[in-house]
């Protein structure tokens, strides 16, 4: 806290400019009018204030706006945004995408800080849903943003927003998140033709059910092994050898290298060895010929 002292004669700041960089903290406190600062916030970002001086400027704004800053000030906070606490940000009402972009720009190149996470949360809640423009902006700054949301939060994403999602935005998503996103993607891309549809839906297939995988196997999609390895194990297990062969096309040869890893390993255990042999890949571990396979899960469901 800077001690309150009268501003020395001739040092009252008529505007926010470079002359202030050699003011002591107490002089900034005494000689800079908070309302002037608020209207000239955009100038602060061009001036090499020290971190201590920025603390004083923040303190002045806090005093002027104890209930939270107006958006006209927030949009021009620049580097001062890095001084804000999540508690400060929770008082804000940010509605403009331009304001959001301006503040994300300040934090560019850094990890998502608690301040940024709070800002995004306030912004999305204010909008009521994660619309396409917002998602576009957020994933541009933070490719992993989508995967940082809970399945519950993802449920508020409208299908139309899925068009903004790039494959790399889903890299860190877990199956629970893809379970929520996949049906939205399916809806969003439903009017596309086969090959185009597959290109768009491919990143989301970690949430696809068995019946959709079966349908894809009839469309000559040639799924690569990386995508196949990300499929839900429970969705892959019921697929027949013929369906997997059609699904993977020329990539089927890659199964051999993955035979010890899920979901390939578990899928092999469910197939007849005779059927696996038809692939000519030397896959081992299938059900020997003459054995009867009982689907106990189906039996339990019936009883």
């Amino acid at each position: 806290e800077v001690e309150k002292t009268a501003c020395p004669s001739g040092k009252k700041a008529p505007e926010i400019d470079e002359s202030l960089i050699f003011y002591k903290k107490w002089e900034l406190e005494a000689c800079v009018d908070a309302a002037l600062l608020a209207t000239q916030m955009d100038r602060v970002n061009a001036i090499p204030f020290t971190y201590e001086q920025l603390d004083v400027l923040k303190h002045k704004l806090d005093e002027l706006y104890p209930q939270g800053y107006p958006e006209s000030v927030i949009q021009h906070l620049g580097y001062l945004f890095l001084k804000m606490s999540p508690e400060d940000i929770r008082k804000w009402n940010v509605t403009s995408l331009e304001t959001l972009k301006a503040l994300l720009e300040v934090n560019k190149g850094h990890e998502m800080s608690p301040q940024v996470a709070t800002l995004i949360d306030r912004f999305v809640k204010g909008r009521g849903q994660l619309d396409k423009d917002t998602l576009d902006t957020l994933t541009a700054f933070y490719p992993g943003y989508l995967c940082s949301l809970s399945p519950e939060e993802l449920s508020s994403v409208p299908p139309s927003s899925i068009w903004a999602v790039r494959p790399q935005d889903l890299d860190t998503c877990d199956p629970r998140q893809l379970d929520v996103l996949y049906p939205k993607a399916r809806l969003a891309f439903q009017n596309m033709n086969g090959s185009e549809y597959f290109v768009k839906i491919q990143s989301f297939l970690g949430g696809a059910p068995t019946e959709d995988l079966k349908a894809l196997s009839q469309q000559n999609v040639s799924m690569d092994l990386a995508t196949f390895m990300k499929l839900r194990t429970d969705a892959v297990l019921p697929l027949t050898v013929a369906e997997v062969q059609k699904l993977l096309g020329p990539h089927v040869e890659g199964l051999k290298a993955e035979e010890r890893h899920r979901p390939v390993r578990d899928w092999i255990l469910r197939q007849r060895q005779d059927d696996l042999d038809t692939l000519g890949l030397g896959l081992q571990g299938g059900i020997p010929n003459g054995y009867l396979v009982l689907d106990l899960s189906m039996q339990e469901a019936l009883s």
């Epitope: 002359s19 050699f22 090499p48 020290t50």
Partner: antibody, heavy 119, light 106 residues
Framework: QVQLQQSGPELVKPGASVKISCKAS????????MNWVKQSNGKSLEWIGV????????SYNQKFKGKATITADTSSNTAYLQLSSLTSEDSAVYYC????????????WGQGTLVTVSA | DIVITQSPAIMSASPGEKVTMTCSAS?????MHWYQQKSGTSPKRWIY???KLASGVPARFSGSGSGTSYSLTISSMEAEDAATYYC?????????FGAGTKLEIK
């Protein structure tokens, strides 16, 4: 302990440019402003300008605008001073100097870099 | 720009003698800092915020002043004090220095 290690002496031709460096150690480079000061032939000191290394914001003495460019690289904790369109008037020792808490002057100085402009 | 006039330009003092040098600013400044420089070395912060002694500076040094008039005083001159002393105003952009007072030992 705080140290500011400057690059070695430079002999440059009139009209050319030179970029001298100041590597900081022993403190958090981004927490303090870095200043550059000129001293011509044992004469007095002239403040050239200052940079906030964290944000890259600068302020210059009007006299050196267009002549000097101050930059900083936070990954290597190094500040730079580039001087352009050199003349004999630019021959001098250039110092980097670390700003101190709440404007308490320049607590630490580099050893100086002698720039000689000669045909 | 604020012009700092330092006087005297050169002075000499005998060991044990009291020494005072002054800086006059063309307009009022909030703080004055003082630096000591010996031949062939970098300046060292000597007195800051008008009257505070930098780390390692002997207690025989003192600084005072306000407005446009500031001074540095050595209560009892010692041989190691022979150097050039520069004052610097810390109030207005751009920062400016005095031309220096060269203090010699008699």
């Amino acid at each position: 302990q705080v140290q500011l290690q400057q690059s070695g002496p430079e002999l440059v031709k009139p009209g050319a440019s030179v970029k001298i460096s100041c590597k900081a150690s022993g403190y958090s480079f981004t927490d303090y402003n870095m200043n550059w000061v000129k001293q011509s032939n044992g004469k007095s000191l002239e403040w050239i300008g200052v940079i906030n290394p964290n944000y890259g914001t600068t302020s210059y003495n009007q006299k050196f605008k267009g002549k000097a460019t101050i930059t900083a690289d936070t990954s290597s904790n190094t500040a730079y001073l580039q001087l352009s369109s050199l003349t004999s008037e630019d021959s001098a020792v250039y110092y980097c100097a670390k700003g101190d808490y709440d404007g308490a002057g320049f607590a630490y100085w580099g050893q100086g870099t002698l720039v000689t402009v000669s045909a | 720009d604020i012009v700092i006039t330092q006087s005297p330009a050169i002075m000499s003092a005998s060991p044990g003698e009291k020494v005072t040098m002054t800086c006059s600013a063309s307009s009022s400044v909030s703080y004055m800092h003082w630096y000591q420089q010996k031949s062939g070395t970098s300046p060292k912060r000597w007195i800051y915020d008008t009257s505070k002694l930098a780390s390692g500076v002997p207690a025989r040094f003192s600084g005072s002043g306000s407005g446009t008039s500031y001074s540095l005083t050595i209560s009892s001159m010692e041989a190691e004090d022979a150097a050039t002393y520069y004052c610097q105003q810390w109030s207005s952009n751009p920062l400016t220095f005095g031309a220096g007072t060269k203090l010699e030992i008699k």
